[in-house]
Interface confidence: medium
């Protein structure tokens, strides 16, 4: 059992779960729904959840919904990464994954969506109202960052209402383009949810082990130029974020930790170890249509014995940043 | 310790084409992209475009579309870029430069640059 | 494209002063990095992700700034410095430099 945060609730079918027709019926509306709720650009879905076993354990998925090849993913609390925002993880499809306490296991889900669980005592643990942010970056197109947050009286055990669209920070300048068939397709997906009100939704069983299970996602646009859509970034309870961590940046270390922008995020304490990730299903959902993860089995493993990761002396030296060319 | 290494300059005629290398060493050659840029006699910097060598296709500038194309061969950690229907406006200093993701997308190493001079 | 504005384009100054030279874009970036470029040499990553110096560059050098506005300082100028700093942003396609910044030493 666990609350859940979605932004908004919506599950799109997956492949298998219905039959022939109730999936074909059900599939018009989701495509529909993406493409007014995207209008043209790439997507960042965020959903955060809290175990209600465990009520200092958080569990934040992400996803990429655009056709770019992501390169780079950056997990925040406290706000967007670059604007106050701590870093808990980062994520590199070749190099592998970086995380810091509170994070205790990151992982890529498929090619396109990645998971972190969080857990913490005291000062370094999240809380209802903390804000966590997921930016993808796919080079040189750009990059998306979407935030969401637990409803701060979502009750562990409850389903969570719907919160407001996430806090969302494109980078990039895309186009809206509102076309004449996409309004028409609006209206008819208006037409169609109202119909489908009035008939029961059939009950789908999430099964905890496949990566095909039926996943809540948080949909919402990406905003296609930062003076399009004014949304202030959540503040947060300032007793949820870490308190010990250290502001410092000795410049020209050769470590990744001296490397973190200090603008863009706190030095975590602490050492952080790159995790072992498993490569994605070939049947997990992938909205990645291009050559990064075009077969799955080339990906390079992440670590291993023998693996130097960063062969170059200067290693890598800052959190952010892009790559993944389409 | 990270290299890259240029061919050498090129003096070419109007309307040929000519094709550049780069050879990187001394680190995981498919972990970083590649980028080509080019800076004209004087002049700033303008980024061409840049090529992953585990993907293979290149990303370009929408300005240099047409112009250059970029490759990647992999078993010799080299990638290459080839100017078409060259004019005397691509005469410049090329340079292929290694990006960093982790740093924001910047330059971390560059190539010493290849001359190209066009002219009849 | 994000078209990235430096100024001045050339800067006088005498060993010990504190100079600043700016980079605006005309349009939100995430991060910029600066580049030292010496006649015939290749540039050289200079300060990456806006405030993070790059390997074997003086403490005397600091960058800051977000949005669309930028700055590298350098607290006392010495002779070594004198060169044109370029800078450069990654936010959207395609990746842009500023026109540069001379700096010469009176």
């Known amino acids: 059992m666990r609350t859940e945060a979605q932004v908004p609730a919506l599950q799109p079918p997956e492949p298998g779960l219905e039959g022939a027709m109730g999936h074909r019926t059900l599939v018009l509306p989701w495509v529909l729904l993406t493409l007014c709720v995207t209008a043209g650009t790439p997507e960042v879905w965020v959903q955060v959840r809290m175990e209600a076993t465990e009520l200092s354990s958080f569990t934040i998925r992400c996803g990429f919904l655009g056709s770019g090849s992501i390169s780079l993913v950056t997990v925040s609390w406290g706000g967007p990464n670059g604007a106050g925002g701590t870093t808990l993880a980062v994520l590199h499809p070749e190099r592998g994954i970086r995380q810091w306490a509170p994070a205790r296991q990151a992982r890529w889900e498929t090619q396109s969506s990645i998971s972190l669980i969080l857990e913490g005592s005291g000062a370094s643990s999240p809380c209802a109202n903390t804000t966590f942010c997921c930016k993808f970056a796919s080079f040189p197109e750009g990059s998306w960052e979407a935030c969401g947050s637990l409803p701060p009286s979502s009750d562990p055990g409850l389903s969570a209402p719907p919160t407001p669209a996430p806090i969302l920070r494109a980078d990039l300048a895309g186009i809206l383009g509102v076309s004449g068939v996409l309004l028409f397709g609006c209206v008819y997906l208006l037409h169609l949810l109202r119909r489908h009100k009035h008939r029961p939704a059939p009950r789908l069983q999430p099964s905890r082990t496949s990566p095909q299970a039926p996943r809540a996602r948080a949909w919402a646009p990406s905003q296609a130029s930062q003076a399009a859509l004014h949304v202030p970034y959540a503040t947060i309870n300032t007793s949820c974020r870490p308190a010990t961590l250290d502001t410092a940046h000795p410049h020209g270390g050769p470590s990744w930790w001296a490397s973190l922008p200090t603008h863009a995020a706190h030095r975590p304490q602490g050492p952080a170890a790159w995790a072992s990730t498993p490569i994605p299903a070939r049947g997990s959902f992938v909205s990645v249509e291009n050559g990064l993860y075009a077969q799955a089995g080339e990906r390079p493993p992440h670590t291993g014995p023998g693996l130097t990761l960063f062969p170059d002396p200067r290693g890598p030296r800052a959190m952010e940043g892009p790559l993944g060319v389409r | 310790e990270v290299q890259l290494q240029q061919s050498g300059p090129e003096l070419v005629k109007p309307g040929a084409s000519v094709k550049i290398s780069c050879k990187a060493s001394?680190?995981?050659?498919?972990?970083?992209?590649k980028n080509w840029v080019k800076q004209s006699h004087g002049k700033s910097l303008e980024w061409i475009g840049a090529?992953?060598?585990?993907?293979?296709?290149?990303s370009y500038n929408q300005k240099f579309k047409g112009k250059a194309t970029l490759t990647v061969d992999k078993s010799s950690s080299t990638v290459y870029m080839e100017l078409r229907s060259l004019t005397s406006e691509d005469s410049a200093v090329y340079y292929c430069?290694?990006?960093?993701?982790?740093?924001?997308?910047?330059?971390?190493?560059w190539g010493q640059g290849t001359t190209l001079t066009v002219s009849s | 494209q994000i078209v990235l504005s430096q100024s001045p384009a050339l800067l006088s100054a005498s060993p010990g002063e504190k100079v600043t030279m700016t980079c605006r874009a005309n349009?939100?970036?995430?991060?910029m990095h600066w580049y030292q470029q010496k006649p015939g040499s290749s540039p050289k990553p200079w300060i990456y992700?806006?405030?993070n110096l790059a390997s074997g560059v003086p403490a005397r050098f600091s960058g800051s700034g977000s949005g669309t506005s930028f700055s590298l300082t350098i607290s006392r100028v010495e002779a070594e410095d004198a060169a044109t700093y370029y800078c450069?942003?990654?936010?959207?396609?395609?990746?842009?430099f500023g026109a540069g910044t001379k700096l010469e030493l009176k």
């Open positions: 992700a806006t405030s």
């Open positions: 001394g680190y995981t050659f498919t972990h970083y992209y």
């Open positions: 430069a290694r990006s960093d993701d982790y740093g924001g997308y910047y330059f971390d190493y």
């Open positions: 450069q942003q990654w936010t959207s396609n395609p990746l842009t």
């Open positions: 349009s939100s970036v995430n991060y």
């Open positions: 090529i992953n060598p585990n993907i293979g296709g290149p």
